[in-house]
């Protein structure tokens, strides 16, 4: 959750955070859905992947995403040079060699093919939210979260603590 003044303080802090290991601490294959139980699906179109938010038909199989978890140092926001604990970051890969990326200029979420080590745009701070939901905050743009806008994934700025629990940035992870 972010206070308005906190967002500016964290802009440098999260960006400077360091992933403590090159290899993930664990991985998890899960389907991703919105707070309102719409599925996140991935479709190959013209040699590139598109991301959709849609209601699935009954018995239609959900797409899976591989979440790779990384432990990361959380820098102190006061000076920017101290360490203020640990946080969990994730990368999300729906298919081999493709990862979700934050495009901060376009405020969009895209699938990019890339090699490891992955760029910072592929890392998201994982927030453990109420009602068995999670949210994904951009490593490269603190205070900006993956959210749902017009049946697509987009980057949404959260400018106050109260807005962290708005439904459009809440997601559910499920093994089924």
């Amino acid at each position: 959750a972010f206070g308005i003044s906190g967002v500016q303080k964290y802009t440098r802090a999260l960006h400077d955070s360091s992933i403590t290991g090159i290899s993930p601490i664990t991985e998890y294959l899960a389907s991703l859905s919105t707070y309102n139980d719409q599925s996140i699906t991935f479709a190959l179109e013209d040699e590139s992947y598109e991301i959709y938010v849609e209601d699935l038909k009954k018995d239609e199989k959900k797409d899976k995403v591989l979440l790779s978890y990384y432990e990361s140092q959380h820098p102190s926001n006061e000076s920017g040079d101290g360490v203020d604990g640990k946080m969990l970051m994730v990368t999300l890969s729906p298919t081999k060699d493709f990862w979700l990326h934050a495009n901060n200029k376009e405020h969009s979420v895209e699938l990019h093919k890339c090699e490891k080590p992955l760029p910072d745009q592929a890392f998201f701070v994982l927030h453990n939210m109420h009602s068995n939901c999670v949210s994904f905050e951009c490593k490269t743009d603190p205070g900006v979260f993956i959210g749902v806008k017009d049946n697509h994934l987009a980057l949404i700025k959260v400018d106050s603590s109260e807005n962290l629990c708005t439904e459009n940035i809440l997601f559910k992870l499920s093994e089924t």
Partner: antibody, heavy 119, light 111 residues
Framework: EVQLVESGGGLVQPGGSLRLSCAAS????????MSWVRQAPGKGLEWVAT????????DYVDSVKGRFTISRDDSKNTLYLQMNSLRAEDTAVYYC????????????WGQGTLVTVSS | EIVLTQSPATLSLSPGERATLSCRAS??????????LNWFQQKPGQPPRLLIF???NRGSGIPARFSGSGSGTDFTLTISSLEPEDFAVYFC?????????FGQGTKVEIK
Amino acid sequence: EVQLVESGGGLVQPGGSLRLSCAASGFTFSSFSMSWVRQAPGKGLEWVATISGGKTFTDYVDSVKGRFTISRDDSKNTLYLQMNSLRAEDTAVYYCTRANYGNWFFEVWGQGTLVTVSS
Amino acid sequence: EIVLTQSPATLSLSPGERATLSCRASESVAKYGLSLLNWFQQKPGQPPRLLIFAASNRGSGIPARFSGSGSGTDFTLTISSLEPEDFAVYFCQQSKEVPFTFGQGTKVEIK
């Protein structure tokens, strides 16, 4: 330096009330989930209550529901625990704790304040 | 609620020895592919200190001699070579669901 300092503990009679405070410094208070955890003398740890960043959600252990209220004032960087209808079994050291960034575990603890409920 | 049972209640060891502490949960503490089991150290008159989070990850500033392992319902905290400052009480705790619960503790004492 990240710091949590509790205050407001003391001796109170059964049925009485007390308000604990926890002053936070060294971090952006509003960005973190905060909790109270207690420890009866010579006993183990018991989670009491949690409030999310943004004050949106609160959770309580069953034994204090309806008697205790957790709240926060982000403008004052302070966490509170209002304790009413106190019982002898509420006697404990009360610790203020901060979750890690992302809210996965209790990461920072205050030194605690002792609450004694006795006639 | 998830009940955590620690064993042994007391462990009597000498400095330099290896300590192995156990924590068993009444049901799985896995969520989102993570084992949400944490370990804390507490010395007399002090608050608990986070040692290990998510079963196997050291907290900030925690020495490498502390390690955690396990998944599902069975977890272990290992101190590879006990230092004099390691004699304390150790608690496991689950953060999978409310009510968050703690084990009753294991006291590591000097033999």
